[in-house]
């Protein structure tokens, strides 16, 4: 806390300008009116205040707005935003996307800080859902944002917002998250033709069920190995050799290099060796000829 001392004669600040950088902490506290600071917040970013001086300015705003800052002040916080704690930010009511953008700009190019995470959480909760414009903004600043959400949070993403998602936005998503996002993407892109549809849906396929993969195999999509390796193992296992061959097209040759890795390894173990041999890739580990395959999961379901 800064002690309350009278402002020296002639030092009362009439505006927020560079002369204030020469003020000591106690002079800033005594000579800068909090209401003046609030109305001229946009000037702070152009002034090289010290960290200590920023603490004083923050303290003045905290005194003026003990219940939380108004959005008109929040929008112009600039780098003073980085002096805010998550507790401070939880008091705010940020509704404007412009305010969100202005504050994200302050931390642009850096990892998501606790302040930014809290701000985004407040903003999204205030909106009730993650609409397209918000998602556009968040993924522009933080490509990994979508994958930082829980499956429960992702369930509030409307299918229309999926149009804003770029492939790199899904790079760090795990299967549980893709399970939620895939049906939304399928719905969002349903009116597109075959090749265009595949281009859009491709990065979401880690959440696709077997029947959708079977359907894709009939459309000459030529899925690359990188996409195939991200598919759910349980969705790949029921695919026949012919279906995988059609799904991958010319990329089928890449299976050999991946035969020891999931899901390829597990899929090979489920195929007849005869069928695998038809690919001419030298894939080994299939079911030998003459062996009967019992589907135990089916048997358990029946009993």
């Amino acid at each position: 806390e800064v002690e309350k001392t009278a402002c020296p004669s002639g030092k009362k600040a009439r505006e927020i300008d560079e002369s204030l950088i020469f003020y000591k902490k106690w002079e800033l506290e005594a000579c800068v009116d909090a209401a003046l600071l609030a109305t001229q917040m946009d000037r702070v970013n152009a002034i090289p205040f010290t960290y200590e001086q920023l603490d004083v300015l923050k303290h003045k705003l905290d005194e003026l707005y003990p219940q939380g800052y108004p959005e008109s002040v929040i929008q112009h916080l600039g780098y003073l935003f980085l002096k805010m704690s998550p507790e401070d930010i939880r008091k705010w009511n940020v509704t404007s996307l412009e305010t969100l953008k202005a504050l994200l700009e302050v931390n642009k190019g850096h990892e998501m800080s606790p302040q930014v995470a809290t701000l985004i959480d407040r903003f999204v909760k205030g909106r009730g859902q993650l609409d397209k414009d918000t998602l556009d903004t968040l993924t522009a600043f933080y490509p990994g944002y979508l994958c930082s959400l829980s499956p429960e949070e992702l369930s509030s993403v409307p299918p229309s917002s999926i149009w804003a998602v770029r492939p790199q936005d899904l790079d760090t998503c795990d299967p549980r998250q893709l399970d939620v996002l895939y049906p939304k993407a399928r719905l969002a892109f349903q009116n597109m033709n075959g090749s265009e549809y595949f281009v859009k849906i491709q990065s979401f396929l880690g959440g696709a069920p077997t029947e959708d993969l079977k359907a894709l195999s009939q459309q000459n999509v030529s899925m690359d190995l990188a996409t195939f390796m991200k598919l759910r193992t349980d969705a790949v296992l029921p695919l026949t050799v012919a279906e995988v061959q059609k799904l991958l097209g010319p990329h089928v040759e890449g299976l050999k290099a991946e035969e020891r890795h999931r899901p390829v390894r597990d899929w090979i173990l489920r195929q007849r060796q005869d069928d695998l041999d038809t690919l001419g890739l030298g894939l080994q580990g299939g079911i030998p000829n003459g062996y009967l395959v019992l589907d135990l999961s089916m048997q358990e379901a029946l009993s």
Partner: antibody, heavy 119, light 107 residues
Framework: QVQLVESGGGVVQPGRSLRLSCAAS????????MNWVRQAPGKGLEWVAV????????YYADSVKGRFTISRDNSKNTLYLQMNSLRAEDTAVYYC????????????WGQGTLVTVSS | DIQMTQSPSTLSASVGDRVTITCRAS??????LAWYQQKPGKAPKLLIY???SLESGVPSRFSGSGSGTEFTLTISNLQPDDFATFYC?????????FGQGTKVEIK
Amino acid sequence: QVQLVESGGGVVQPGRSLRLSCAASGFTFSSDGMNWVRQAPGKGLEWVAVIWNDGSNKYYADSVKGRFTISRDNSKNTLYLQMNSLRAEDTAVYYCARDRGPLWPLDYWGQGTLVTVSS
Amino acid sequence: DIQMTQSPSTLSASVGDRVTITCRASQSISRWLAWYQQKPGKAPKLLIYKASSLESGVPSRFSGSGSGTEFTLTISNLQPDDFATFYCQQYQSYSRTFGQGTKVEIK
């Protein structure tokens, strides 16, 4: 007068860790931001990391993100750089330097400590 | 990150010469630019900050100018003590990137 003294450098194998320290005196350490800057032999200066006065904000160069951690102990007037998963290209003289605010230059520098990453 | 490009990389000059070094930023950094001097085996020393403000104790033969993306450091009357490497650095962004350096050597 302001003094910054780095220590903790030495020879280390690739993949290993090292912690550098910077002891500060002659100014109110808890009021100012602190940076690490490095210089590979015969090369230019490369900014590595900054930590704000109260430790609330830390920023890193892309080349060290996820491997290096900057921290400070204001009660001991000491700045640290924890370096993990070291690579040959991390070989450099490491300097600590002070800044007084987000829009301030690096006005005081230490003399540097040499880190050599080699097998 | 903001890229800083200095030119020339090396500059040969004589005592008494007027020397100019240029620094270019990949995006506008307003006037948040510093210049440092470094001698072999020594730590860098701050010469100029905020593009044109002279650091206390630095001789007035050093001057800086520019704003936005184009900046210059001028040494008006090169002295024997001035032969060194000079670096520009932006500090508008928290990633305070340096230029690659300009070595001023004796002609």
